[in-house]
């Protein structure tokens, strides 16, 4: 009876999410493998988040709006492990917008989700950021490694969206 009611609850939750995400990919989690964590298909998952790489070339503002429509934000990178996971799926000859910007050009970088900007957990390429005119951050492959660079916000780039996993 308990299992039945849990299944009914899950199905109703799935139906609720289905209006936003036509398909979800779920895995069993938790110590009793009773919880399901889901990401929209074909998003990838890492720890408690889902990631989507958009190959549509758009400005930073339009890229963030695009993520927002999908219930996400441009990616906020919190650890080196997270960055290493993300970059596995990126193309080395492309650049991708991050959810990091300096809208006033004061070198006060801010994440889209208001996560505090921690200078000790940043992955700027050597010599970057280098221009207060360039107020948005990308991740790209340079000098044999992935890192961040400041660029003009209105120049179209690919982008990475991030959202919290859906638990049912």
């Amino acid at each position: 009876n308990f299992m039945y009611s849990k299944t009914v609850k899950r199905l109703s939750k799935l139906q609720e999410y289905q209006q936003y995400y036509p398909s979800l990919t779920c895995v069993m989690e938790g110590k009793d493998m009773e919880d399901w964590s889901c990401c929209p298909t074909p998003w990838t998952s890492f720890q408690s988040s889902c990631y989507f790489i958009s190959t549509v070339m758009q400005s930073w503002t339009k890229s963030q709006n695009n993520c927002s429509v999908m219930g996400a934000d441009l990616v906020v990178i919190n650890t080196k492990e997270e960055q290493d996971f993300i970059t596995q799926n990126l193309k080395i000859n492309s650049a991708y917008f991050l959810g990091l910007s300096d809208p006033k050009g004061w070198r006060h970088w801010q994440w889209v989700d208001q996560t505090p900007y921690n200078k000790n957990v940043t992955f700027w390429h050597s010599g970057e950021p280098n221009s207060p005119d360039e107020r948005c951050a990308i991740i790209n492959f340079r000098s044999e490694e992935w890192g961040w660079n400041d660029v003009h916000c209105h120049v179209p780039q690919k982008s990475i969206c991030k959202m919290k996993k859906i638990y049912i």
Epitope: Q58, S59, W60, T61, K62, Q64, N65, S101, P103, K104, G105, N130, S131, P132, D133, E134, R135, C136, V151, H152, C153, H154, V155, P156
Partner: antibody
């Protein structure tokens, strides 16, 4: 006072090349992003190229990509536009302009007087 | 590309009267409360001059008879009391996304 003086325009045959220069004074050139904008005779304005302050990032519309190259020499306070494979539709007055960011966008706040490029056989 | 459509193509207004120019973007050029539309004035034989940035901010040194308004896709430049020196072509421009694009221009003349 900000001054921008373009030079290098002239008459060139289709398929030919030309290099425009823009001499800047009255501001710290090396800290400014710069752009070129053109205006065909009796027509509107068209953005042609942008280069960031350090010269390491350049941007172009599809209409000139692969044919035009923007560059700068910060030691000489000079902006350049190398134009190759010129076509009749590149005939225009070419203006250089300073770029000023505005949050996530920008404005072109100071403009030179322009130099005329005519592509004709 | 974002297309900027200006109307009318030309406008004849009496001295001291109001002149209104419209500009429509093919998609929204707003983000986080700011609109990325600028207005320029070009007098015959001269380069363009920046009048308004961010849809409604008056550039330093520009007379306050010029004003800008609008958001999303619809923007307006207003000259509250036309002066003889305002005879020019006016252009709107979006800077939200490359390629930057300009409207076709509106020629303002004295009636």
């Amino acid at each position: 006072e900000v001054q921008l003086l373009e030079s290098g325009g002239g008459l060139v045959q289709p398929g030919g090349s030309l290099r425009l220069s823009c001499a800047a004074s009255g501001f710290t050139f090396s800290t400014y992003t710069m752009s070129w904008v053109r205006q065909a005779p009796g027509k509107g304005l068209e953005w042609v190229a942008t280069i960031n302050s350090g010269g390491d990032n350049t941007y172009y519309p599809d209409s000139v990509k692969g044919r035009f190259t923007i560059s700068r020499d910060n030691s000489k306070n000079t902006l350049y536009l190398q134009m190759n494979s010129l076509r009749a539709e590149d005939t225009a007055v070419y203006y250089c302009a300073t770029y000023r960011p505005y949050y996530y966008g920008s404005v072109l706040d100071y403009w030179g007087q322009g130099t005329t490029v005519t592509v004709s056989s | 590309d974002i297309v900027m459509t200006q109307s009318p193509d030309s406008l004849a207004v009496s001295l001291g009267e109001r002149a209104t120019i419209n500009c429509k973007a093919s998609q929204s050029v707003d983000y986080d409360g700011n609109s990325y539309v600028n207005w320029y004035q070009q007098k015959p034989g001269q380069p363009p001059k920046l009048l308004i940035y961010g849809a409604s901010n008056l550039e330093s040194g520009v007379p306050d008879r010029f004003s800008g308004s609008g958001s999303g896709t619809d923007f307006t430049l207003t000259i509250s009391s036309l002066q003889a020196e305002d005879v020019a072509v006016y252009y709107c421009q979006q800077s939200d996304e490359d390629p930057w694009t300009f409207g076709g221009g509106t020629k303002v003349e004295i009636k």
